[in-house]
Interface confidence: low
């Protein structure tokens, strides 16, 4: 399977909400022994590999924001901790999973990574990630709503295969 990022860049005004999205592509085994661990974290564009550094999002670690379920099941974080920080991660039946960030500030600007680990019989089989940039703007040049820029299909940084 692969992880795709439909949008590589999100440009949003301060105070707006945004939902960053990744999508699980390809055949997904729905066996009872197969589960998926999905999470989000901030990173930097490393010299070796994008998403190599796992930083917290608004002081919440990748572990705080993770989802763990079978196949294309729906799930979302109901953690009070995440919601108190204006965050919620979710996953639907179609392989989409997302993180919603409320009331954006300039400090939220940066590189965001989604991570998916496929687990079989307690053994991790594949680990794939996607990356996208969030730019939060203020002042007269800021858009009135979030503007999203699609990823090019050639963008190897935004689709990783297992």
């Amino acid at each position: 399977f692969k992880v795709a990022t439909p949008y590589s860049l999100y440009v949003c005004p301060e105070g707006q909400n945004v939902t960053l999205t990744c999508r699980l592509l390809g055949p997904v085994d729905k066996g009872h022994d197969v589960t998926f661990y999905k999470t989000w974290y901030r990173s930097s564009r490393g010299e070796v590999q994008t998403c190599s550094e796992r930083r917290p999002i608004r002081n919440l670690t990748f572990q705080d924001l993770h989802l763990h379920h079978g196949g294309h099941q729906a799930a979302n974080t109901s953690h009070d901790l995440a919601q108190r920080h204006g965050l919620e991660s979710a996953s639907d039946h179609h392989g989409n999973f997302s993180i919603t960030m409320r009331n954006l500030t300039l400090l939220d600007s940066g590189l965001y990574c989604c991570l998916v680990v496929e687990i079989r019989h307690h053994h991790s089989e594949h680990r794939v990630h996607g990356a996208m940039e969030l730019q939060v703007q203020t002042g007269k040049d800021a858009p009135s709503n979030c503007v999203v820029y699609p990823s090019s299909s050639q963008d190897s940084e935004n689709i990783t295969a297992a």
Partner: antibody
Framework: EVQLVESGGGLVQPGGSLRLSCAAS????????MSWVRQAPGKGLEWVSG????????FYADSVKGRFTISRDNSKNTLYLQMNSLRAEDTAVYYC?????????????WGQGTLVTVSS | DIQMTQSPSSLSASVGDRVTITCRAS??????LAWYQQKPGKAPKLLIY???SLQSGVPSRFSGSGSGTDFTLTISSLQPEDFATYYC?????????FGQGTKVEIK
Amino acid sequence: EVQLVESGGGLVQPGGSLRLSCAASGYIFTGYDMSWVRQAPGKGLEWVSGIDGHFDSSFYADSVKGRFTISRDNSKNTLYLQMNSLRAEDTAVYYCARSSYAVDLAFDYWGQGTLVTVSS
Amino acid sequence: DIQMTQSPSSLSASVGDRVTITCRASQGISSYLAWYQQKPGKAPKLLIYAASSLQSGVPSRFSGSGSGTDFTLTISSLQPEDFATYYCQQHYTTPPTFGQGTKVEIK
């Protein structure tokens, strides 16, 4: 069968350094985050440090931050803990542990432990 | 950091007894709680993760329950090999933190 075997413990003076190793076998090493957990004599368990199985991102307890460095050599299936500026309160049995479910913070396999004694 | 508090710190019981150990988190951790068993001179052994999921190979007399801040480990019928120290651990966030332990001794 999953096996974790620690080595490198011993007696060291305060301010000294020690490097612990943990040799892993029986599973795909790169698929799992790994941690070091310690236990002072007669005391409970304390997580020390963890490292990502894929990217080598590392995490530390406040008590060791800046003094200890976790690393791994995936080609050798080995986890390391470099311990510098050791203090008496670092005296403990050090266990390496594998994260259950790849990137979780529960630990499903543990080594037998290696004793580190910091004393003058 | 999230503090984990276990009670009791020790207990005496007989073979065949039903034993209950409780663990309380200083803040909500959803269902991200693990239980370990440790015998003297040995490494801890994972019994239960995600509050109630039994680790492979662990006898069914061990069970876990709870969510949020309050959790319980139950041994339905204590066996001779169950005399040990039990630790709870939150695996909700970094750093993972452990309870102080509950020693189960022979009465």
